[in-house]
Interface confidence: low
């Protein structure tokens, strides 16, 4: 199709070379009731906020991206040639950094429903350059953690080394959606609730004598509860004996309970007794079977192929540690009458 | 840019307690955490405790009895008390913000930003 | 807790020579491994963060590698403004930990 007709506008994104952050493109379609791109009737002004990247209506629910390559080959689509970047919806995620996703990107519903729909398009032209010692050295993180309970503030990493005085406006989105209220830099929130947890993206226009383009930087949060201040306990087994057939196999699981920790490193594992020896056991990998904000439960199984009257003289042991201490619960094994 | 101004005294007698302050300024103390260091004269570093903005802390539990790390946001700023000091606490202390780095699918932290050190002397 | 040792203690190099530090770790630790560069009466400063990437602004002769419980600093063209103390740090459980601290001179 000619996008000639498109809406243009251009984005800045100036990744920081310290973490894996993502970016994401918005289907911004330009508004009905102000342009002639898009077919007039679709939605009514009402429906449809200032600046709107998720349009509400079905019709725009759906789009086609496509990258522009810059030898004027015939337009990509985004699906078949770009592993690393993802559609959904009318939003493009891309999941790693790099001046390679510099380029023009184009987006359109994926109905036509009239002649005019066709040109109903968007140009995108993204820059992207790592950040430079001349830029901020110390801007705030993508990943930022909020306290459950506590106040706190969600900084625009591109502009987390402007004091709110000198900041321009910015343009606020949690998981795709315009947060119409935030203006500044900062986002504060006075009680930290889980549903703060999300993507937020931040926009602020730049410009030149030549053009003005927008700068975008992805945060994700993440809401956290304080680090734990116990030590993980054990969920099973409960009992300290355990009545087993002879030359039958057996399977033992462990399951422990471990809080929340900034810096996790649960350790969770088999060891056997017998007499004055004791040693690990190679047993198969640890699995996360639940997790919430405030702990995760983890479990592991010791698998005997059968047992043997060795066994029985045997102390079976699960040892469970966090940073705060351990924890370990002994199964003896009891044949069965 | 973030900076980290340390202040407190340079001398504390025995059997007293050590108070340091560190001042956050060109950015917010809200969603880090921020650590203080210690280094003995001629030795090596030794990670004393970490706060979170909120107020939750970290100790190191050789030094756990003894420390006190607080955090005031309006003024944004953190200290640091460490009691009953004796002449084995002599040492640089440094103020210092762990910053998360999303690395291999994970959180690390690792301290970004320092403040100047300040040389405490116990000492009667 | 969690030990780290370096290795030299000590090292004495000229400019421009290829120079590794090792550190090893008393456990596994994955990659949660930095190094950090201390010049007298600094502060020290961030080089290395998850092992191997390099922090912004940290010249690319810098570079860092490994996993687990055995990891390398290496700096492959010794420039004067180099020599330091230099520290390696663990934060992958607590508490957090640093190496005793290998000292590069000139030779």
């Known amino acids: 199709f000619n996008i000639s007709g498109c809406s243009t506008k251009k984005l800045l994104w100036t990744y920081s070379t310290r973490s894996e952050e993502e970016f994401v493109l918005f289907c911004d379609l330009p508004e009905p009731q102000k342009s002639h791109f898009c077919h007039r009737n679709r939605l009514s002004p009402k429906q449809v906020p200032e600046h709107l990247p998720f349009m509400g209506s079905n019709d725009l629910s759906d789009v086609q991206w496509y990258q522009q390559p810059s030898n004027g080959d015939p337009l990509e689509d985004i699906r078949k040639s770009y592993p690393h970047i993802i559609q959904d919806k009318c939003t493009l995620h891309f999941l790693t950094p790099g001046v390679n996703n510099s380029g023009s990107y184009i987006c359109r519903p994926k109905m036509i429903k009239s002649p005019y729909d066709v040109a109903c398009c968007v140009k995108m032209i993204l820059e992207v350059k790592p950040q430079t010692n001349a830029s901020c050295e110390y801007s705030a993180s993508h990943k930022q953690d909020l306290l459950l309970g506590s106040t706190g503030s969600i900084s625009c990493p591109s502009l987390s080394c402007q004091s709110d005085a000198q900041s321009p406006a910015v343009t606020w989105y949690k998981n795709g959606k315009l947060l119409s209220v935030e203006r500044s830099n900062r986002i504060v929130v006075d009680e930290v609730y889980d549903y703060h947890q999300g993507t937020y993206v931040c926009d602020y226009t730049q410009s030149d004598t030549v053009s003005s383009w927008t700068v975008r930087a992805v945060v994700q949060v993440r809401t956290i509860v304080g680090d734990t201040k116990l030590k993980p306990d054990i969920l099973d087994p409960v009992e300290d004996t355990l009545e087993v057939e002879l030359g039958k196999p057996l399977t033992i699981s462990c399951k422990a309970r471990f809080g929340f920790e900034r810096v996790f490193n649960p350790v969770i594992k088999w060891y056997i007794k017998d007499s004055d020896l004791e040693w690990e056991v190679s047993v198969p990998e640890a699995k996360s079977i639940k997790s919430t904000l405030k702990d995760e439960i983890i479990e592991r199984n010791i698998i005997l192929e059968k047992v043997t009257q060795r066994d029985l003289r045997r102390k079976f042991v699960c040892f469970v540690q966090n940073s705060i201490g351990n924890t370990t619960q002994s199964v003896q094994l009891k044949e069965k009458r | 840019q973030v900076q980290l101004q340390q202040s407190g005294p340079g001398l504390v007698k025995p059997s007293e307690t050590l108070s340091l302050t560190c001042t956050v300024s060109?950015?917010?103390?809200?969603?880090?955490?921020w650590s203080w260091i210690r280094q003995p004269p001629g030795k090596g570093l030794e990670w004393i405790g970490y706060i979170f903005y909120s107020g939750t802390t970290n100790y190191n539990p050789s030094l756990k009895s003894r420390v006190t790390i607080s955090v005031d946001t309006s003024k944004n700023q953190f200290s640091l008390k460490l009691s009953s000091v004796t002449a084995a606490d002599t040492a640089v202390y440094y103020c210092?913000?762990?910053?998360?780095?999303?690395?291999?699918?994970?959180?690390?932290?690792?301290?970004?930003?320092w403040g100047q050190g300040t040389t405490v002397t116990v000492s009667s | 807790a969690i030990q780290l040792t370096q290795s030299p203690s000590s090292l004495s190099a000229s400019v421009g020579d290829r120079v590794t530090i090792t550190c090893r770790a008393s456990?596994?630790?994955?990659?949660?491994l930095a190094w950090y560069q201390q010049k007298p009466g600094k502060a020290p400063k961030l080089l290395i963060y998850?092992?191997?990437s390099l922090e912004s602004g940290v010249p690319s002769r810098f570079s860092g590698s490994g996993s687990g419980t055995d990891f390398t600093l290496t700096i492959s063209s010794l420039q004067p403004e180099d020599f330091a103390t230099y520290y390696c740090q663990q934060f992958n459980s607590y508490p957090i930990t640093f190496g005793q601290g290998t000292r590069l001179e000139i030779k």
């Open positions: 060109g950015g917010s103390i809200n969603n880090y955490y």
């Open positions: 456990q596994g630790i994955s990659s949660a």
């Open positions: 210092a913000r762990d910053v998360g780095i999303a690395a291999r699918n994970s959180y690390y932290y690792v301290m970004d930003v």
């Open positions: 998850d092992a191997s």
